[in-house]
């Protein structure tokens, strides 16, 4: 098992300047580590590519809400 304490931290140094279509997004994770220069959200797209985004932007918050709801909704 990897040592979580020593696991490498992905930091965001720039944020995307684009609003990403929510249909292209699969998941997200928050970056809050003190080792990073700024708080961020990293979206993972449906083709497993990662994008740094600014958690203060409304579209980012809306996208996280949408993904949260998708996760909570059971597949029938």
């Amino acid at each position: 098992q990897p040592d979580a304490i020593n696991a490498p931290v992905t930091c965001c140094y720039n944020f995307t300047n684009r609003k990403i279509s929510v249909q292209r997004l699969a998941s997200y994770r928050r970056i809050t580590s003190s080792k990073c220069p700024k708080e961020a959200v990293i979206f993972k797209t449906i083709v497993a590519k990662e994008i740094c985004a600014d958690p203060k932007q409304k579209w980012v918050q809306d996208s996280m809400d949408h993904l949260d709801k998708q996760t909570q909704t059971p597949k029938t």
Partner: antibody, heavy 122, light 107 residues
Framework: EVQLVQSGGGLVQPGGSLRLSCAAS????????MSWVRQAPGKGLEWLAN????????YYVDSVKGRFTISRDNAKNSLYLQMNSLRAEDTAVYFC???????????????WGRGTLVTVSS | AIQLTQSPSSLSASVGDRVILICRAS??????LAWYQQKPGKAPKLLIY???SLESGVPSRFSGSGSGPDFTLTISSLQPEDFATYFC?????????FGGGTKVEIK
């Protein structure tokens, strides 16, 4: 099949105009930024312009600003490049490309058209 | 505009060789760098994005590294189908720019 099919190239006189088209299929065109890139014969690649998903935001390289216009029609899954006041130095193969966001920046290309040759000559 | 300088402009190598291509940026581009392979008469093909991420479907013999100003593309064991021209591209800022390319030829 995910692809970009280009049309509209050809021979045009200096000062003339031409419109290039790029038809997308196999993916949801309206979810992506799109770009045009060109390559002069035997030379490197030059990014020209890109356009946001709904067409509201556009960026151009200085060498074509004011002469070329990028546009799109999401209902037709099509991207366009209107080229006016053409010069001999615009002679190149023109590629359309799907334009993605990276971890620390925006604008690399994971899907390309096959290219169309534009020759500007009298 | 950010200028990208690729070196060497061309190189000769044999099948099985380890090949290292260099792309130097005139100013910081973080890890916003991509590498493409282009064969004559064809469109470029994406190999690497975010400086070191391998595009889906690209053989693992290709790898990228660096975080500016120097980036490298390494081909661990050159295959016959790898003889082509390779371009780097920065997407840190507009205008998006490409390097001049490195042509990998058969020795």
């Amino acid at each position: 099949e995910v692809q970009l099919v280009q049309s509209g190239g050809g021979l045009v006189q200096p000062g003339g105009s031409l419109r290039l088209s790029c038809a997308a299929s196999g993916f949801t065109f309206s979810h992506y930024w799109m770009s045009w890139v060109r390559q002069a014969p035997g030379k490197g690649l030059e990014w020209l312009a890109n356009i946001e998903q709904d067409g509201s935001e556009k960026y151009y390289v200085d060498s074509v600003k004011g002469r070329f216009t990028i546009s799109r029609d999401n209902a037709k899954n099509s991207l366009y490049l209107q080229m006016n006041s053409l010069r001999a130095e615009d002679t190149a193969v023109y590629f359309c490309a799907r334009d993605l966001e990276g971890l620390h920046g925006d604008g690399y290309f994971d899907l390309w058209g096959r290219g169309t040759l534009v020759t500007v000559s009298s | 505009a950010i200028q990208l300088t690729q070196s060497p402009s061309s190189l000769s190598a044999s099948v099985g060789d380890r090949v290292i291509l260099i792309c130097r940026a005139s100013q910081g581009v973080s890890s916003a760098l991509a590498w493409y392979q282009q064969k004559p008469g064809k469109a470029p093909k994406l190999l690497i994005y975010d400086a070191s991420s391998l595009e889906s479907g690209v053989p693992s013999r290709f790898s990228g590294s660096g975080s500016g100003p120097d980036f490298t593309l390494t081909i661990s064991s050159l295959q016959p189908e790898d003889f082509a021209t390779y371009f780097c591209q920065q997407f840190n800022s507009y205008p998006l720019t490409f390097g001049g390319g490195t042509k990998v030829e058969i020795k």
